[in-house]
Interface confidence: low
């Protein structure tokens, strides 16, 4: 570490005095201090002498000696006061620029340490500091305004009491700049716009920044629009607003509009699309198939997408039958708005009951008229089966009726012994009926089919079983001949309750 002679931290001299500061190090050394006149510098290898024969108040300041070759970067310093009764302040800079929330050093150096007790900071023309100005003073460095705010951008003077009167420094202008985090913030409203030809429209492009120096413009397709700009300042931000008012829109006004703002940090842009239409429109669509099949007891959500302009004046879900005059519960109907002109409407149908099969229609209305979208909901049922013994054209016949949706397939089994259900080991014969007779097949209802098995002689120690199945499930009915006469026996687990 270099050594300064005289080896004192502070040196106080009178104007006109001779001052010699010597710095000695292991290698070459350099002086650094406030820019001031009358100093001469002599260097010889490892020492350097800074001297003046006529010290003035402007020589007041801290002089630092460094050794450039020292890897530890050590330095030594001495502070020189040139005590001038007429000049209590040496101002090193008349303009100080900092960013908001930084500390701002106003470099007015006191030329006489004795005056320290009577110093103060004021704004020019004797105006007091703004409220909440937090500052400190160092006789070596000057006044520091802590965490400077933009509003503290003012002209300041340093004041010292000398013989009962205040003596001011020359003024120092403080410029506190807003920290500009990036390009201006932008809003372009609306995000999307539809108007009917001849209607009025408004597009507003606004940009804001903490700093006033930014530009904003609105362009249509690639043409920059000449629009008067409104400027404002609130919430500590500068705002510039461009408002495009169109009294009667036409097709040439349609297209892409971009709001662009730029500052030293860069450029931001955002776009919207303006559509001009000939007349009001209302379009209903669904991503779902309009013909729906759901197993009884399960749930279904019916969804309709609506594109409309102007906005809807009314909408509802209606059940069109055929089973009852019930209407969908309003709490099961839900509306969500994707954006201004597109909406999704959902009807939730939980745990569907047989009476809820049928047509569901979504109706919507706007000035363009009414539109409707209708879903057809068919419920799927596992088959229900029953078997009876009868005579047809004199022949003993087992008659199996199976009801379900989709249409059930029918298989007959004959097996040994009396059983609720034939298993593989007992099966004596199997007959598939590829074309059972369809007894009823109405929309939204179960399909009922009938299959006949002609039996010349009923074997009394055997079971005849009719099995029906479809994509939902299966059902069966075991017919057990009893010597006293035909007897049917449906196993409990095939009883079906919707």
């Amino acid at each position: 570490i270099p050594v300064i002679e005289p080896s004192v931290p502070e040196l106080v001299v009178k104007p006109g005095a001779t001052v010699t500061l010597r710095c000695v190090g292991n290698g070459s050394v350099e002086w650094d201090g406030p820019p001031s006149p009358h100093w001469t510098l002599y260097s010889d290898g490892s020492s350097s002498i800074l001297s003046t024969n006529n010290a003035t108040f402007q020589n007041t300041g801290t002089y630092r000696c460094t050794e450039p070759g020292d890897p530890l970067g050590g330095s030594a310093a001495i502070h020189l006061y040139v005590k001038d009764p007429a000049r209590p302040w040496n101002v090193l800079a008349q303009e100080v620029v900092v960013f908001e929330d930084q500390d701002a050093l106003l470099p007015c150096l006191l030329t006489d340490p004795v005056l320290e007790a009577g110093v103060s900071l004021v704004r020019v023309r004797g105006r007091p500091l703004m409220r909440h100005t937090n500052y400190s003073f160092s006789p070596w460095h000057g006044f520091t305004i802590h965490r400077a705010k933009f509003i503290q951008s003012q002209d300041y003077q340093c004041s010292a009491l000398m013989g009962g009167r205040k003596v001011m420094s020359i003024s120092i202008r403080l410029k506190v700049q807003k920290v500009i985090p990036g390009p201006p913030a932008l809003t372009l409203v609306p995000a999307e716009l539809v108007r009917i030809r001849g209607e009025a429209a408004q597009i507003v492009c606004s940009a804001s920044s903490v700093d006033v120096n930014f530009d904003v413009f609105l362009q249509h397709n690639n043409t920059k629009l000449a629009i008067p700009q409104q400027s404002d300042f609130h919430n500590n931000r500068y705002q510039k607003v461009l408002t495009l008012n169109l009294d009667q829109v036409d097709f040439q006004h349609a297209g892409n509009y971009s709001c662009v703002a730029s500052n030293v940090q860069g450029k931001h842009s955002t776009s919207m699309f303006f559509r001009v239409v000939e007349s009001a429109y209302l379009n209903l669509s669904s991503e779902q198939n309009l013909i729906q099949e759901v197993t009884v007891g399960e749930g279904l959500n019916l969804k309709v997408m609506v594109e409309a302009y102007p906005g809807l004046q009314g909408f509802n879900w209606t059940y069109l039958g055929p089973f009852s005059d019930h209407q969908p519960e309003p709490k099961l109907a839900n509306a969500t708005t994707k954006d201004t002109y597109r909406h999704t409407f959902t009807l939730s149908l939980p745990r569907l009951k047989p009476s809820e099969a049928g047509r569901y229609s979504f109706l919507a209305r706007n000035p363009g008229g009414w539109r409707a979208l209708t879903f057809e909901l068919t419920l799927r049922y596992p088959p229900e089966v029953s078997v009876i013994w009868t005579f047809i054209n004199g022949s003993g016949t087992l008659l199996c009726a199976a009801s379900g949706y989709p249409q059930p397939n029918v298989t007959w089994l004959q097996c040994s012994g009396h059983t609720d259900r034939c298993d593989e080991a007992q099966v004596l014969q199997v007959w598939d009926d590829p074309y059972p007779e369809v007894l009823s097949q109405e929309p939204f209802h179960k399909v009922t089919v009938q299959s006949l098995l002609t039996v010349e002689t009923l074997e009394h120690n055997q079971t005849y079983e009719c099995r029906a199945h479809n994509s939902v499930g299966s059902g069966s009915w075991a017919f057990i001949p009893i010597s006293a006469g035909a007897h049917t026996h449906p196993p409990d687990e095939f009883l079906f309750t919707p």
């Epitope: 108007r195 009917i196 001849g198 209607e199 009025a200 408004q202 009001a280 102007p310 906005g311 809807l312 004046q313 009314g314 909408f315 509802n316 209407q327 309003p330 109907a333 509306a335 708005t337 201004t340 909406h343 000035p367």
Partner: antibody
Framework: EVQLQQSGPELVKPGASMKISCKAS????????VNWVKQSHGENLDWIGL????????SYNHNFRGKATLTVDKSSSTAYMELLSLTSDDSAVYYC???????????????WGQGTSVTVSS | DIQMTQSSSYLSVSLGGTVTINCKAS??????LAWYQQQPGNAPRLLIS???SLETGVPSRFSGGGSGKDYSLIITSLQTEDVATYYC?????????FGGGTKLEIK
């Protein structure tokens, strides 16, 4: 501040027609609907109809079709209701109201004019 | 048209008390219901929209409830300035229709 300023009270003869005005201020006139409501005997409220200022579209209560005609003047942000072939049954206070702009807010009437008293008498 | 029925034309309640005003629609109105307050000599004022949403500036002692066809307006801690006629209005189906009103008086 949103305001709807209606024209003053009217005394008209049976069979005559008259026009009530409603000047809107403090909001974008074309972004909302204007509704008209009749209040008879200081009690029952009846919705007459609405007009959409941005395109002049109207929707009437069928009970007032042929009785009321709704119009707007966008340049002065003013809505008008003309009442035709007046009878004593038309004596009432008539209010203009601001209605919601689209279906998401529905058409609740969030601001009301001070009302215009109409007396039909010979 | 959807008819709106307010079961009570008049209600008399003590200061600080709680009152429930009922409104029944002749058909489902899917919560598209508004409540208005009309103080003597004034125009109606919107209190509640969407059956339950309190408008800005309306005291929290007012609340709305209900669904389907049946709705209610509840006023707690009744104040003298609550003396008024209260109307319900459906805006589900054109023509919009109002209830006959319920006049609230202080006992």
């Amino acid at each position: 501040e949103v305001q709807l300023q209606q024209s003053g009270p009217e005394l008209v003869k049976p069979g005559a027609s008259m026009k009530i005005s409603c000047k809107a201020s403090g909001y974008s006139f074309t972004d909302y609907t204007v509704n008209w409501v009749k209040q008879s005997h200081g009690e029952n409220l009846d919705w007459i109809g609405l007009i959409i200022p941005y395109n002049g579209g109207t929707s009437y209560n069928h009970n007032f079709r042929g009785k009321a005609t709704l119009t707007v003047d966008k340049s002065s942000s003013t809505a008008y209701m003309e009442l035709l072939s007046l009878t004593s049954d038309d004596s009432a206070v008539y209010y203009c109201t601001r209605g919601g702009g689209d279906f998401t807010t529905g058409y609740t009437m969030d601001y009301w004019g001070q009302g215009t008293s109409v007396t039909v008498s010979s | 048209d959807i008819q709106m029925t307010q079961s009570s034309s008049y209600l008399s309640v003590s200061l600080g008390g709680t009152v429930t005003i009922n409104c029944k629609a002749s058909d489902h109105i899917h919560n598209w219901l508004a409540w208005y307050q009309q103080q003597p000599g004034n125009a109606p004022r919107l209190l509640i929209s969407g059956a339950t949403s309190l408008e800005t500036g309306v005291p929290s002692r007012f609340s709305g409830g209900g669904s389907g066809k049946d709705y209610s307006l509840i006023i707690t801690s009744l104040q003298t300035e609550d003396v008024a006629t209260y109307y319900c209005q459906q805006y589900w189906s054109i023509p919009w229709t109002f209830g006959g009103g319920t006049k609230l008086e202080i006992k």
